[in-house]
């Protein structure tokens, strides 16, 4: 019965970008400006998302697909479909309720978003620290001390921190 009904339903012939207009004898009408339908057989078109304020338009709305937003410089997307924009911090910092704060000793953040993470524990893998960590960089692990040739220094000072470092994604 369901299949028969759908075959007889004139709305099922309405393609994406149109809607089945009940006010006009179920004729397929194009979506009005600033609206879209991404699938066929729709009885209404959805209102396009508007990218305002800290959001900027990444992809314009079309009759068949919604607009997509990203964030203005200095902010990065959070949530599915970039539902929120969050302030960037510098490398070596994390965003708290009180704003951007430096990473504590023993932690780092090599991006403009996210949290400060503990330096990798190289010994977990039986390795040694090859390059020391900084606020902006994780340690680099190297061979286990037993693998080093006699007289070889095991720890390299950290590479100088540079901007922009890891770009926000």
């Amino acid at each position: 019965f369901e299949r028969t009904r759908s075959l007889q339903d004139p709305c099922s012939n309405c393609p994406a970008g149109t809607f089945c207009d009940n006010n006009r004898n179920q004729i397929c009408s194009p979506c009005p400006p600033n609206s879209f339908s991404s699938a066929g057989g729709q009885r209404t078109c959805d209102i396009c998302r508007q990218c305002k304020g800290v959001f900027r338009t990444r992809k314009e709305c079309s009759s068949t697909s919604n607009a997509e937003c990203d964030c203005t410089p200095g902010f990065h997307c959070l949530g599915a479909g970039c539902s929120m924009c969050e302030q960037d911090c510098k490398q070596g910092q994390e965003l708290t309720k009180k704003g951007c704060k430096d990473c504590c000793f023993g932690t780092f953040n090599d991006q403009k978003r996210g949290i400060c993470r503990p330096w990798t524990n190289c010994s977990l893998d039986g390795k040694s620290v090859l390059v020391n960590g900084t606020k902006e960089r994780d340690v680099v692990c190297g061979p286990s001390p037993a693998d080093l040739s006699p007289g070889a220094s095991s720890v390299t000072p950290p590479a100088p921190a540079r901007e922009p470092g890891h770009s926000p994604q």
Epitope: L124, D125, D138, V140
Partner: antibody, heavy 119, light 107 residues
């Protein structure tokens, strides 16, 4: 020893989705980044994104942001990558990799999963 | 994104030859440069990380050098089992990027 074992080859139709798995063993799964890398036929390597399984924090290459979704299941030490709205140009070998101890290099690679998109 | 320009794209050399591959980054990546070997069966292996550090178990004929934007990978004495494609990769900045690869063949 450290091992990453990927799921088998997949053949999909355009518009479909596919979920590739990467089962880790021989180390503490939550302590290392898992990356996904692709190689189209006759082409070089492209980094898709990565995940830190401890808290499922992800990074994506902007190019793949609308194509790939990376997840991890701590209980089974398995990482996943789902590819949506497949097109013929998504035909490639997909590798999962583990970092060497810090995210800056990839020390262990899975055997690769071939995804073929064809009508 | 940081572009990695690797050369040559292919090379043919004899067993025992010294082979050099170069990789140039479009901006300073400090020492965050890695070299990978992809065998004909598609298996991939990290050989050199942090520019010059050979992974344990990697034969001493493989070495790397450089800093900043210019890097070199050397096989001091080519062996038949070194037939592979070699890739450089920068780990300095997201998104991580690879060179186009160098396909190495034996004469």
């Amino acid at each position: 020893q450290v091992q990453l074992v990927q799921s088998g080859a997949e053949v999909k139709k355009p518009g479909a989705s596919v979920k590739v798995s990467c089962k880790a063993s021989g180390y503490t799964f939550t302590s290392y980044w898992i990356n996904w890398v692709r190689q189209a036929p006759g082409q070089g390597l492209e980094w898709i994104g990565n995940i830190y399984p401890s808290d499922s924090y992800t990074n994506y290459n902007q190019k793949f942001k609308d194509k790939a979704t990376i997840t991890a299941d701590k209980s089974t030490s398995t990482a996943y990558m789902e590819l949506s709205s497949l097109r013929s140009e998504d035909t490639a070998v997909y590798y999962c990799t583990r970092d060497y101890g810090s995210a800056y290099s990839m020390s262990t690679w899975g055997q690769g999963t071939t995804v073929t998109v064809s009508s | 994104d940081i572009q990695m320009t690797q050369s040559p794209s292919s090379l043919s050399a004899s067993v025992g030859d010294r082979v050099t591959i170069t990789c140039q980054a479009s901006q300073d990546i400090s020492n965050y440069l890695n070299w990978y070997q992809q065998k004909p069966d598609k298996t991939v292996k990290l050989l050199i990380y942090y520019t010059s550090r050979a992974r344990s178990g990697v034969p001493s004929r493989f070495s790397g050098s450089g800093s900043g934007t210019d890097f070199t990978f050397t096989i001091s004495s080519l062996q038949p089992e070194d037939i592979a494609t070699y890739f450089c990769q920068q780990g300095d900045t997201l998104p991580y990027t690879f060179g186009q690869g160098t396909k190495l063949e034996i004469k």
